[in-house]
Interface confidence: medium
């Protein structure tokens, strides 16, 4: 969680002198309660906007908007504390609107906005606006909170933001999987335009249970420039047990911008549909056994055996 450093946030508007200050999230009115406190915000809304930095980066930001209730308590309103809590880390960031003049009723409802909290893809936040001073210990609450879910990098509008591009969002590997003869699986995907290694992970499951019965990891060395955007092929030798047939394939890149934290792309291959006449599998076959990690891995795979399944994934 952080604040945009440009442009400087503004809270002043016609009829109100105001400045935005960093806050410790612990307003003085908690420690020194006041007798008269303002009512709570009205119609708190949070939207996802996008902000360009001076360096040309594009970041998703939480656009916070609220209005004041039309009661006499605005005469005691000294400002507002805006708090954003990232739910999975409990990290909190606050700013304070400090009113430098008294509010007066005017012909339209007072409305405030703030768009400087930078948010992360696929994260959930709790946004709270507290009117200041905060209420006395047994007083009515004068804050409003809303949860806010930021789309992940798969989303078209998030895809072009700097944090998403840094994690490889623009790379579309277009993974295809072919089931070959002789217990083999060929995985093919498109390389990105960076000389960086990849890892292809295969994990197999039985159709009826969700425990893994086989797994293999294959490394692909960093491609040369002439191989950028070309297809890479990896062939896996599968478990010899026919029931270990539900395959989950992941391609993990190691781009320089995200290293071990790059977005992974995955595809699943379901077990083939079997007719009712199939011989039931022996009970012993249910014991998960690990196969030797064999099979070849390279860019060009001339093994052109007929495939029985084709699975595509974006």
């Amino acid at each position: 969680l952080r604040l945009l450093d440009f442009p400087a946030p503004v809270c002043a508007q016609e009829g109100l002198s105001c400045r935005v200050k960093n806050s410790t999230c612990l307003d003085d009115s908690w420690i020194h309660p006041r007798n008269l406190t303002p009512s709570s915000p009205k119609d708190l809304q949070i939207q996802l906007h996008f902000a360009h930095t001076q360096q040309g980066d594009l970041f998703p930001v939480a656009h916070i908007e609220w209005t004041l209730q039309t009661d006499a308590s605005i005469l005691y309103l000294e400002g507002a504390e805006l708090s954003v809590l990232q739910l999975n880390t409990n990290e909190r960031l606050c700013v304070r609107f400090e009113f430098l003049s008294k509010l007066r009723h005017h012909h339209r409802r007072w409305r405030f906005t703030f768009s400087h909290f930078v948010v992360d893809p696929d994260q959930e936040y709790e946004v709270t606006v507290h009117h200041l001073p905060k209420p006395i210990p047994d007083g009515d609450p004068n804050h409003q909170s809303k949860n806010f879910l930021v789309p992940d990098c798969e989303h078209a509008r998030m895809k072009v933001t700097t944090p998403c591009m840094s994690s490889g969002s623009l790379w579309d590997p277009n993974i295809t999987v072919e089931t070959l003869e002789a217990h083999q699986l060929r995985v093919s995907f498109t390389l990105w335009n960076e000389s960086t290694p990849y890892q292809v992970l295969l994990e197999s499951f039985s159709d009826s249970e969700n425990h893994s019965c086989f797994d293999v990891v294959k490394q692909i060395f960093a491609p040369r420039q002439e191989e950028f955007h070309q297809r890479a092929n990896v062939t896996f030798t599968l478990s010899k047990f026919h029931w270990c047939c539900h395959h989950h394939v992941q391609v993990q890149p190691f781009f320089s911008s995200c290293l071990n934290d790059c977005l992974r792309h995955a595809v699943t291959v379901p077990c083939p549909v079997i007719s009712n006449t199939t011989v039931p599998k022996p009970v012993a076959d249910y014991i998960p056994l690990w196969e030797p990690r064999s099979g070849s891995s390279d860019y060009k795979d001339d093994d052109d055996k007929g495939s029985s399944h084709h699975h595509h994934h974006h």
Epitope: Q45, I46, Q47, L48, H49, F50, H52, L58, H63, S145, K146, N147, F148, L149, V150, P151, E154, H155, A156, R157, K159, V160, H313, H314
Partner: antibody, heavy 131, light 107 residues
């Protein structure tokens, strides 16, 4: 209420550049994406590309090599340029706004995001490519 | 690109009929889908956004449902002004793509 109005020449010669402008009235161009879509005679709708008010663009890969979309926030306008046109580019060209990513108020105070899509369209302008 | 298919491509119906149009995406698009109505010589008009939310000002006889890859537009009781072509639009992945359209005409 926001309104969009396309403008530009109705006739363009093959190999030349088609230029259209969309003027936004009744609202600000800020915090929205602005799209160009076309519809060839008797055909379906094809998204050409879009521009964010800050200048970031996305183009349809099928047209990317020929398309440029730009924005002029001071005039509340955005523009389309399509180079090296052929008769296949004869179509009705629409400009459209698509909304901010916003939030749907679910149960209680919980908010889920949704993405508005194209909510406001211009009435369209016919462009014929012919010598 | 995500391919959007619509069925049927055309249908004939009478005033008062219940009409259902289906749109399928070639891959999952969550609920990032809108339904549009277009009449001859006019721009498309959005009826449904986020797969199931009714656009402000649109009659409640229009409804949308679905998520992922399969979506439905339903007109509960067809009115004379509803005879038009209907398109779905996915805006989950670039390039955004429209369905080929479903023409609803008078039986």
């Amino acid at each position: 209420q926001v309104q969009l109005q396309e403008s530009g020449p109705g006739l363009v010669k093959p190999s030349e550049t088609l230029s259209l402008t969309c003027t936004v009235s009744g609202g600000s161009i800020s915090n929205y994406y602005w799209n160009w879509i076309r519809q060839s005679p008797g055909k379906g709708l094809e998204w050409i590309g879009d521009i964010y008010y800050s200048g970031s663009t996305n183009y349809n890969p099928s047209l990317k090599s020929r398309v440029t979309i730009s924005v002029d926030t001071s005039k509340n306008q955005f523009s389309l340029k399509l180079s090296s046109v052929t008769t296949a580019d004869t179509a009705v060209y629409y400009c459209a706004r698509d909304g901010e990513l916003a939030n749907y108020y679910g149960s209680g105070s919980y908010q889920f995001y949704y993405y508005y899509g194209m909510d406001v369209w211009g009435q369209g302008t016919t462009v014929t490519v012919s010598s | 690109d995500i391919l959007m298919t619509q069925s049927p491509s055309s249908l004939s119906a009478s005033v008062g009929d219940r009409v259902t149009i289906t749109c399928r995406a070639s891959q999952g698009i969550r609920n990032d889908l809108g339904w549009y109505q277009q009449k001859p010589g006019k721009a498309p008009k959005r009826l449904i956004y986020a797969a199931s939310s009714l656009q402000s000002g649109v009659p409640s006889r229009f409804s949308g449902s679905g998520s992922g890859t399969e979506f439905t537009l339903t007109i509960s009781s067809l009115q004379p002004e509803d005879f038009a072509t209907y398109y779905c639009l996915q805006h989950n992945s670039n390039p955004f793509t429209f369905g080929p359209g479903t023409k609803v005409d008078i039986k």
